[in-house]
């Protein structure tokens, strides 16, 4: 019968010939009367056999990631008779792994959107690296993820590549962040190879800004001949949020005379001061009213940023018109 152990050859061996093992018949008494032959893919080019001893050698550098095993056939012939001593047998040479591949992030570029002011622990995105080395061979393909850039706002789970928020972020201070993640094989031990990827994290807006008047005092004038419904001027508040979070409503907070009204121009987000009742210079030549501004809609959890509505004082001077 045939006698051999399992055959392994390390990949990327630089020697011109590397002894893999021996293949022999148990009828071989060592007097060089038998001839061993190798057949199959790789025989003669990648692997050779010593015809007398049955020793097998790799004569080419191998790459496990290209081909991880070779199936060959062995023959043994009695030189004197030319007959087969054993039936032809199939055997396997396995290419064993070395850590010659760095982790690669295949889904680049990564981009994620997360709401500003999200609490610590909020999941942002998961990044995944692949390592072409053999996952069953030691730690060659066991990866650990770490953060190279992005502290203190982000953290990455070492074994999963899940990126989470580690500190609240405010879109109005910075609206996007570049995070750099490194994946290291060999679970970070000496000899590890690494790859990096960048993640663009954009903050989406939440309603964490209340509108605030540009001026604390406005001066307007109205002619005593102005009919009711006349627009006598505009007031303006700032809201640094965007989109619907910046939509605002103006209203009168104080107007003892009940002479004026304020409507909101939702296109320009300005407040328009309107004459509600006709004015008479001889009766009253100036008015003081207070206007306030609020966001259209504020979710309950964001009310702490909207505790008191901004107000402004409007001084309105009535212009005299000569009366017949």
């Amino acid at each position: 019968g045939w006698v051999w152990n399992q055959f392994f050859v390390p990949e990327e061996m630089n020697t011109t010939s590397h002894h893999i093992g021996q293949l022999r018949s148990d009828l071989d008494n060592g007097n060089n009367s038998f001839q061993y032959k190798l057949l199959g893919a790789g025989a003669g080019s990648t692997f050779i056999i010593d015809e007398r001893t049955g020793d097998i050698y790799a004569i080419q550098k191998l790459d496990r990631e290209e081909r991880s095993l070779y199936i060959l056939r062995a023959q043994v012939i009695d030189i004197a008779t030319g007959r087969a001593v054993e039936p032809e047998s199939e055997f396997v040479i396995k290419v064993s792994d070395i850590n010659d591949n760095e982790p690669k992030f295949l889904d680049e570029p990564y981009e994620a959107i997360v709401p500003e002011m999200s609490p610590e622990g909020t999941l942002v995105i998961q990044v995944t690296a692949s390592d072409a080395d053999d996952p069953s061979s030691g730690n060659n393909a066991r990866l650990l993820y770490s953060l190279l850039q992005g502290q203190p706002y982000f953290s990455v789970e070492p074994t999963t590549g899940v990126i989470r928020i580690s500190s609240k972020m405010d879109r109005e201070l910075q609206d996007e962040y570049w995070v750099i993640i490194q994946a290291k094989d060999m679970i970070g031990q000496p000899g590890a190879l690494s790859g990096t990827t960048s993640v663009l994290i954009k903050l989406s807006d939440v309603n964490d800004n209340k509108p605030i008047f540009k001026e604390s005092l406005y001066r307007l004038t109205v002619s005593e001949s102005a009919p009711t419904g006349t627009s006598i001027g505009t007031i303006m508040a700032y809201d640094n949020d965007i989109g619907e979070n910046a939509e605002m409503d103006y209203s009168i907070e104080e107007d003892d005379s009940q002479t004026f009204d304020i409507i909101t121009n939702h296109e320009t987000q300005e407040g328009i001061v309107i004459l509600k009742k006709k004015v008479d210079f001889e009766h009253q030549n100036h008015y003081g009213i207070r206007a306030k501004v609020k966001n259209h809609h504020v979710p309950e959890q964001l009310m702490k940023y909207h505790t008191e509505a901004s107000t402004t004082f409007i001084k309105i001077q009535v212009e005299d018109v000569d009366e017949p």
Epitope: R171, Q174, D175, I212, E215, N240, T307
Partner: antibody
């Protein structure tokens, strides 16, 4: 790292002029408004002036209006304060400070998040 | 012009809670920032927009703002918190600082 460094301070006689500079590094200078704030010896902070990120708007404290001019050169990452007609009460440590907030935001709700180490101006005869 | 008023000094024992107030007309309608300044050093922003923390500031510092008064609260006060504290607000395109409060940790 993010840094602001003031220079140009010194001793000057009343009525004379002085120009302060503030060199920025470690951040995109052209995206931020910058303030000048001063502090007289043993006194509190007093706001002096602000310039928007693109130089389009400038505002001044009443105490310096008409005498001081704030300007910036974004190509040189530098802020300036030209101080004319100096008075004894202008003696102080002058700080430049970055206005927190991205371009497009307005107002000064987010504070001043980066400050220089200050440069001392002494107005004395 | 708009004015912000702070008490000149506040004292607190280590581990206790310190409260520093800042008052101004209808201040609750505005947003307030707070700065810490130690002797010979530049100011540091510790609270902005009434109650938000800049990166790196411990949550022992907190802020509130209502009516005519904003308050900076330091819980579990430490010796290293001894400093001058300034409130700051914005009014009609100008910036206003309070006069400052010296916090002494006894």
């Amino acid at each position: 790292q993010v840094q602001l460094v003031e220079s140009g301070g010194g001793v000057v006689q009343p009525g004379r002029s002085l120009r302060l500079s503030c060199a920025a590094s470690g951040f995109t200078f052209s995206r931020y408004g910058i303030h000048w704030v001063r502090q007289a010896p043993g006194k509190g902070l007093e706001w002096v002036a602000v310039i928007w990120y693109d130089g389009s708007n400038k505002y001044y404290a009443d105490s310096v209006k008409g005498r001081f001019t704030i300007s910036r050169d974004n190509s040189k990452n530098t802020l300036y304060l030209q101080m004319n007609s100096l008075r004894a009460e202008d003696s102080a440590v002058y700080y430049c400070a970055r206005r927190a907030g991205i371009p497009g935001t307005t107002g000064y709700y987010y504070g001043m998040d980066v400050w220089g180490q200050g440069t001392t101006v002494t107005v004395s005869s | 012009s708009y004015e912000l008023t702070q008490p000149p000094s506040v004292s607190v024992s280590p581990g206790q809670t310190a409260s520093i107030t800042c008052s101004g007309d209808r201040l609750g309608e505005k947003y307030v920032s707070w700065y810490q300044q130690k002797p010979g050093q530049s100011p540091i922003l510790v609270i902005y927009q009434d109650n938000k923390w800049p990166s790196g500031i411990p949550e022992r510092f907190s802020g509130s703002n209502s009516g005519n008064t904003a308050t900076l609260t330091i819980s579990g006060t430490q010796a290293m918190d001894e400093a001058d504290y300034y409130c700051q607000a914005w009014d009609s395109s100008t910036v206003v600082f309070g006069g400052g409060t010296k916090l002494t940790v006894l």
